[in-house]
């Protein structure tokens, strides 16, 4: 049968390349079963996730799934960094794996460069 | 059923290009990474890179890079090798693999297309 | 890159025996989770590989309990407690905390 646990479906080592100034979501898909967890995202600094108080953040709820939405309005080269989201379900902390934010700066870059020249080409990214 | 098929493989001369597929089915390929590894005659195994089918993000050994494209089509469970200038040294059995990107929960892989480089 | 190496690189063993393997990688195979991405694969002579043990230690689904995996930050082990006749093949540590992702040379466990 189907586990009732909170599960937060985010890849490991899973990444996402985009501009500065553009709007962006980033996106903890969580399957609950009866009642929905409280979620939070935080962003790393070193071995420490640091808790994003005070952000736009939105449910949205597809069929088997719903998505915990932080929202980035533009986004900031300053945004650059690992994320991760937390279920707070049963008093327990159910944590995902990070999921990295390559920002470039299109003021620095002549042309937009692809995803994977992003993620493969650290000196166009802010740390 | 759980079936990764590779296909496209056989004879082809150096410097020319080949696409080898990767048909899956029994799982949502979009939960998965597609990793591709290849195992020359006698030797180990080596992995050519991975592809995210969800959005398209690719990694790669770096000595494929450039030469070496990864893709997949998400809505038809399919993932694609492209290998271009090959050389005698890429001879191998070619597998392309899925592993569950969330908790790791199976590594399923293909059962290989041979490679031949030569004139 | 990091680089794993496998001992021994083949091994003569009986039916009944234990046997161990080891994989030592060059640095820590520890990702920012607390975990280590260490794989072990089989693979029997003309065939694919086949994902025995994932995570160091979980055994994959429908792999027999006689195998299990140890080990922590650079050093891992597979041990076979009682080998069966099945179990004669070229085995291979491989990690996916680090890219590229990087494989033992492999051993290959033969009949005595």
């Known amino acids: 049968k189907e586990s009732c646990d909170v599960q937060l479906y985010i890849k490991r080592q899973s990444y996402h390349s985009i501009f500065a100034g553009d709007p962006f979501k980033l996106e903890c898909p969580v399957k609950y079963c009866a009642h929905r967890p409280q979620v939070t995202w935080c962003k790393l600094n070193g071995t420490t996730c640091v808790k994003l108080e005070g952000r736009h953040t939105s449910w949205k709820q597809e069929k088997n799934l719903s998505f915990f939405i932080l929202h980035f309005e533009p986004v900031l080269p300053s945004d650059n960094g690992s994320y991760r989201c937390s279920a707070n379900f049963l008093s327990a902390i159910i944590e995902s794996h990070s999921t990295t934010l390559y920002v470039t700066d299109v003021k620095s870059a002549s042309e937009r460069p692809s995803k994977d020249e992003m993620a493969s080409r650290p000196w166009l990214l802010y740390s | 059923e759980v079936q990764l098929v590779e296909s496209g493989g056989g004879l082809v001369q150096p410097g020319r290009s080949l696409r080898l597929s990767c048909t899956t089915s029994?799982?949502?390929?979009?939960?998965?990474?597609i990793h591709w590894f290849r195992q020359a005659p006698g030797k180990g195994l080596e992995w050519v890179g991975r592809n995210d089918p969800a959005n398209g993000n690719t990694k790669y050994t770096a000595s494929f890079k450039g030469r070496a494209t990864i893709s997949a089509d998400g809505s038809k469970s399919i993932a694609y090798l492209q290998m271009n200038s090959l050389k005698t040294e890429d001879t191998a059995v070619y597998y392309c693999?899925?592993?569950?990107?969330?908790?790791?929960?199976?590594?399923?892989w293909g059962q290989g297309t041979l490679v031949t480089v030569s004139s | 890159d990091i680089q794993m190496t496998q001992s021994p690189s083949s091994l003569s063993a009986s039916v009944g025996d234990r046997v161990t393997i080891t994989c030592r990688s060059s640095q820590s195979l520890l990702d920012r989770d607390g975990k280590s991405y260490l794989n072990w694969l089989q693979q029997k002579p003309g065939k694919a590989p086949k994902r025995l043990i994932y995570?160091?230690?979980k055994l994959d689904s429908g792999v027999p309990s006689r195998f299990s995996g140890s080990g922590s930050g650079t050093d891992f082990t597979l041990t076979i407690s009682s080998l069966q006749p099945e179990d004669f093949a070229t085995y291979y540590c491989?990690?996916?905390?680090?890219?590229?992702?990087?494989f033992g040379q492999g051993t290959k466990l033969e009949i005595k």
């Open positions: 995570l160091v230690s």
């Open positions: 491989w990690q996916d905390t680090h890219f590229p992702y990087t």
């Open positions: 029994g799982f949502n390929i979009k939960d998965t990474y």
């Open positions: 693999a899925s592993y569950e990107g969330y908790y790791e929960r199976f590594g399923y």
